[in-house]
Interface confidence: medium
Amino acid sequence: AGVFELQIHSFGPGPGPGAPRSPCSARLPCRLFFRVCLKPGLSEEAAESPCALGAALSARGPVYTEQPGAPAPDLPLPDGLLQVPFRDAWPGTFSFIIETWREELGDQIGGPAWSLLARVAGRRRLAAGGPWARDIQRAGAWELRFSYRARCEPPAVGTACTRLCRPRSAPSRCGPGLRPCAPLEDECEAPLVCRAGCSPEHGFCEQPGECRCLEGWTGPLCTVPVSTSSCLSPRGPSSATTGCLVPGPGPCDGNPCANGGSCSETPRSFECTCPRGFYGLRCEVSGVTCADGPCFNGGLCVGGADPDSAYICHCPPGFQGSNCEKRVDRCSLQPCRNGGLCLDLGHALRCRCRAGFAGPRCEHDLDDCAGRACANGGTCVEGGGAHRCSCALGFGGRDCRERADPCAARPCAHGGRCYAHFSGLVCACAPGYMGARCEF
């Protein structure tokens, strides 16, 4: 048993043009969090199993709001390690998927919205009990820098955490500095001591007394960066202190190949030899396959049978994004009829209907006149979610309850005089005019 530990150092726009300034905006503050998924090495069944070695979720990072015009700072990250406990043996070779998620804290109805910003994947060899390994991964325009290690939980020891070492109750026959080990009483376990002076940051050992270097470092104690270790470089001026030629700026300096790719110079530029699972000019494209289950929300993964070919997610209705991780703004499809107000609650869609309409999508036109009587012989007229009364002569108002003065509107043209009558109105026309309203 033991724990895999992952430390995220930075997440932000990668180098080069077209990189985004920030995953958040001034209008929409957000915060980041991470999810890691581990699968055992290269076994075939590992592809189907989700995070069979374990998985972990980081805390939320601090809320970040982009300041327009200000230089893009490092994005605030969640505190602490991501820890993935494992119960059985550490497999030595493992696959990982690290996802960076954005939580938008705007004014969405129904709470925050989530979207997948970046997903990186890789296969690595790692012995338990070794030092922190460092990595840089690129996903699209984003760059993720992190370190990881596997450590055994007592009493487990060894590179796979399979041997048990526990102190005996009986006096130890082991020499000073050695621990008695189960299951054999006479077996003594020496704490792993690397070669004296071996760099604790850039070197490690799997056998006592050795000093093996992490990528990018060399020398007997792993203290020399690879780019300055060679005196064979034909470029650049001579260094007075070492007598070596100080390398000038070569195309492979600083190793432009990401994700453990190795750089070799070509007559015009450089060439990256990418490890399995990565491709692109600088090995920056991560080879997530359909087996890693990259499509969310029931999206169908097509292609991507091996890490050298890309995958495409065909999203079900209501979802979009390269991984079907974004919910379509379903209100933009205007599902509410008859002028209803659409509310996307996240887990459901609601329509708030105008008066006179009902149903999940406001599709039912209620009988506006039901139970509505118009007084004094008026008739009810439906329309627009409200009822209206067409009143008999001499009556007015919403329900025809008010007596109306038929002459109030001056209906008699050309100076005719109006007289109210029980059957309506009568116009007495001025000389030279005629008609019911003196219109002729």
Epitope: C37, A52, A55, E103, P112, W114, F296, N297, G318, A348
Partner: nanobody
């Protein structure tokens, strides 16, 4: 192997209570959104409750709101559904399910869920 195993179903009288459990093996529910669904004979499978991994938020369908409560114990890798004031119309096969997306979105659609249990029968007699 990935497995979700439901338990706790059975026969109960109307007004009674049951607590369903769903234990996961082969993966960690802490990083999965977990939901409870049910399917009555001759009817479509309907979502009744969900707990998201991102917000720790829970959603409950209107038909069971105030009576059913979803919860999870990540340390035990188990999802629960506490069902109170049961009614005969709650009779159905109950399933738990898991999906990688952090939110309980999608109109309770079962299509977004990747892993399913075999189900446990709940029968409420009047």
């Amino acid at each position: 192997e990935v497995q979700l195993a439901e338990s706790g179903g059975g026969l109960v009288q109307a007004g009674g209570s049951l607590r369903l459990s769903c234990t996961a093996s082969g993966f960690t529910i802490a990083v999965y959104t977990m939901g409870w669904f049910r399917q009555a004979p001759g009817k479509e499978r309907e979502g009744i409750s969900c707990t998201s991994w991102a917000g720790g938020r829970t959603y409950t369908a209107d038909s069971v709101k105030g009576r059913f409560t979803i919860s999870r114990d990540n340390a035990k890798n188990t999802l629960y559904l506490q069902m109170n004031s049961l009614k005969p119309e709650d009779t159905a096969m109950y399933y738990c399910a898991a999906k990688a997306h952090p939110d309980c979105s999608g109109d309770w659609s079962p299509s977004g869920y990747e892993y399913w249990g075999q189900g446990t029968q709940v029968t409420v007699s009047s």
